[in-house]
């Protein structure tokens, strides 16, 4: 999916107003310097890219993320903002329904976690140079 | 304007069944995140169940089972098939728009249930 | 799922300060919203994402949330905001929504 024409500062209110506590609940009794930004993006629709990916696609020693409460707000949100984002999902949800995992929070999912936090640092201040 | 619009409510026998159904207008129907709220009279809000775009569904416990929930984008409706009703099903049922999954920014008038012999 | 627990009924004069509160396991680690409720009528939103408010509400409602209590805070009280507030949060096992039992707010 390209997310060039989403309405980013909509996601960006979603994100500030109901997903980034979720994501800091998750990580609760983590410490924040535990684990380093791997993951980067460049402008909001590749940080979106990355998001996506992170969030919904199952990595090795962490297949669980797609399930969890900030999963689900933010596949709302690009539903809402993104158009034809939904239509787009339609057929990949069908596949993931098939390979449901049980929702176990891994170190790996963890680290994951914390590359999403950044992600999503990165998309909220756009106008950053690259580090 | 956003508009929600309950239909199929009525009075069932204990151990019946009933299919509700919500028009939505207004807004893009299939991105959104629908379910389906009630209220027992004079009693509190009671989340029944939801919906994703992509027909994943979710319920409550206390009707996982017995209800059902879909959604038929082409058309803006939302339905809500109730089967082997109880007592305790009797209430208010309003349709809602789930904001961003986790909240409620607009409901329906409501279609009331009446489950008695 | 998590259990969300209000006051029945909260009593305040005209243009005094109203506060009900909605208790629950490490709430302040969720996300709490609040609807008002008037007799006959489906609820309206009036706060989001513990402290925001949808566009139309009154500036005198805000919220706030913090260890295992939020609170929805009415300032000036009108006999208009005489109404059921519902608190709603969200359980993080079963992702499921849920609500508080609905505070009855009388103005005297």
């Known amino acids: 999916y390209d997310f060039t024409n989403c309405d980013f500062e909509k996601i960006k209110a979603a994100y500030l107003s109901t997903i980034s506590k979720d994501l800091i609940t998750y990580m609760s009794g983590t410490k924040s310097t535990e684990f380093n930004n791997t993951v980067s993006c460049s402008n909001r629709p590749h940080c979106l890219t990355e998001i996506q990916s992170l969030t919904f696609n199952p990595t090795a020693g962490c297949a669980s993320l797609a399930k969890e409460m900030f999963a689900m707000k933010t596949k709302a949100a690009l539903a809402i903002w993104c158009p034809g984002y939904s239509e787009t999902q339609i057929n990949a949800t069908q596949a993931m329904k098939k390979r449901r995992k049980r929702k176990v929070t891994t170190n790996k999912c963890l680290e994951q976690v914390s590359q999403l936090q950044g992600l999503w640092r990165r998309f909220n201040r756009p106008l950053l140079k690259q580090q | 304007q956003v508009q929600l619009v309950e239909s199929g409510g009525g009075l069932v026998q204990p151990g019946g069944s009933l299919r509700l159904s919500c028009a939505a207008s207004g807004f893009t129907f299939s991105s959104y995140y629908m379910s389906w709220v009630r209220q027992a009279p004079g009693k509190g809000l009671e989340w029944v169940s939801g919906t994703f775009f992509d027909g994943s569904t979710y319920y409550a416990d206390s009707v996982k089972g017995r209800f059902t929930i879909s959604r038929d984008n082409s058309k803006n409706t939302l339905y809500l098939q109730m089967n082997s009703l109880r007592a305790e099903d009797t209430a208010v049922y309003y349709c809602a728009r789930q904001q961003y999954f986790d909240h409620i920014d607009i409901w329906g008038q409501g279609t009331l249930v009446t489950v008695s012999s | 799922d998590i259990e969300l627990t209000q006051p029945p009924s909260v009593s305040v004069a005209p243009g005094q300060t109203a506060r009900i509160s909605c208790g629950g396991d490490s709430l302040g680690g969720k996300y709490v919203y609040w609807y008002q409720q008037k007799p006959g009528q489906a609820p309206v939103l009036v706060i989001y994402?513990?402290?925001k408010r949808p566009s139309g509400i009154p500036e005198r409602f805000s919220g706030s949330n913090s260890g295992n209590t939020a609170t929805l805070t009415i300032s000036g009280t009108q006999a208009e905001d005489e109404a059921d507030y519902y608190c709603?949060?969200?359980?993080?096992?079963?992702?499921?929504?849920?609500f508080g039992g609905g505070t009855k707010l009388t103005v005297l």
């Open positions: 709603q949060s969200y359980d993080l096992k079963s992702l499921n929504v849920v």
């Open positions: 994402g513990d402290s």
